[in-house]
């Protein structure tokens, strides 16, 4: 088992909004849960965009999930990752 490296980034979207992207990379096996939580509960699936789980060329995998949020409400969002029985949460950077 190779645990993922998780990285959260933010980019400007429309006025007053930002897109936050959570990337998991260099993990094996390929089964992974990667999702955004808002206010501690599941963020509706139709407000999230997922990338495919793809090989990254080193025998491991990578994927991502993104969502658009209001600027100033970053604290309410966390990226949740679960892989091979381990889990972690990752805040949006300031």
């Amino acid at each position: 088992t190779v645990p993922p490296m998780v990285n959260v980034t933010r980019s400007e979207a429309s006025e007053g909004n930002i897109t936050v992207t959570c990337r998991a990379s260099s993990f094996y096996p390929r089964n992974i849960i990667l999702t955004w939580r808002q206010d501690g509960v599941s963020l509706a699936h139709d407000t999230q965009q997922w990338g495919d789980v793809l090989p990254d060329g080193n025998g491991t995998y990578q994927t991502w999930v993104a969502t658009r949020i209001c600027r100033g409400e970053e604290q309410r969002f966390t990226c949740y990752m679960e892989h091979s029985g381990n889990h972690s949460t990752h805040p949006v950077p300031s």
């Epitope: 206010d39 949740y80 949460t89």
Partner: antibody, heavy 119, light 107 residues
Framework: DVQLQESGPGLVKPSQSLSLTCTVT?????????WNWIRQFPRNKLEWMGY???????NYNPSLKSRISITRDTSKNQFFLQLISVTTEDTATYYC????????????WGQGTLVTVSA | DIQMTQSPASLSASVGETVTITCRAS??????LAWYQQKQGKSPQLLVY???MLADGVPSRFSASGSGTQYSLKINSLQPEDFGSYYC?????????FGAGTKVEIK
């Protein structure tokens, strides 16, 4: 460590308002987290009532939405529960608690305060 | 709303026994589940979060499992301090709801 302490009257008359205070020590309620009220009825059923978060946003249980208000006093690091038009069905032990945004589970609770609704 | 159904409502067991408590959700909660222990006259205490993760300080005789709509809490080699009531709680969506509880009593 975050510590929470509930306070308020132990007896309320039917049709009146129930008002409780949660005093938080060890953490600023404006820094982070969702600050919640949960109640436990005499037969032990637990009900999540609602929260006010670090920025003052509230979220209530729809079953209580027309009767509940959660507010705060940031200068005293307190948050409050008001429940209007109470009936004997609102007799319960009321707890305050909080959760972090990594998941809406409750790591610590206050000791609880029993409120009896009776004429 | 998602309803949480716990079973059994109560059970009697002896010190050293293994007991299992189950919790069924009315919809898929995708492991968004917590377990609490409550002793008489005390506040609930967090045991498990994210369906399987033991909270800080919880003894390793406790374990939890499940997925989808079915979850369980297992206590191996029951100790005197384990007697009390146990509740599950989902956090998949609002409103957050709890199971009705399982009372674990001394046989």
């Amino acid at each position: 460590d975050v510590q929470l302490q509930e306070s308020g009257p132990g007896l309320v008359k039917p049709s009146q308002s129930l008002s409780l205070t949660c005093t938080v020590t060890g953490y600023s309620i404006t820094s982070d987290y969702a600050w919640n009220w949960i109640r436990q009825f005499p037969r032990n059923k637990l009900e999540w009532m609602g929260y006010i978060n670090y920025s003052g946003t509230t979220n209530y249980n729809p079953s209580l939405k027309s009767r509940i208000s959660i507010t705060r006093d940031t200068s005293k690091n307190q948050f409050f529960l008001q429940l209007i038009s109470v009936t004997t069905e609102d007799t319960a032990t009321y707890y305050c608690s909080y959760y972090r945004y990594d998941g809406a589970w409750f790591p610590y609770w206050g000791q609880g305060t029993l409120v009896t609704v009776s004429a | 709303d998602i309803q949480m159904t716990q079973s059994p409502a109560s059970l009697s067991a002896s010190v050293g026994e293994t007991v299992t408590i189950t919790c069924r959700a009315s919809g898929n909660i995708h492991n968004y589940l917590a377990w609490y222990q409550q002793k008489q006259g005390k506040s609930p205490q967090l045991l498990v979060y994210n369906a399987i993760m033991l909270a800080d300080g919880v003894p390793s005789r406790f374990s939890a499992s499940g997925s989808g709509t079915q979850y369980s809490l297992k206590i191996n080699s029951l100790q005197p301090e384990d007697f009390g009531s146990y509740y599950c709680q989902h956090f998949w969506s609002f409103p957050l709801t709890f199971g009705a509880g399982t009372k674990v009593e001394i046989k």
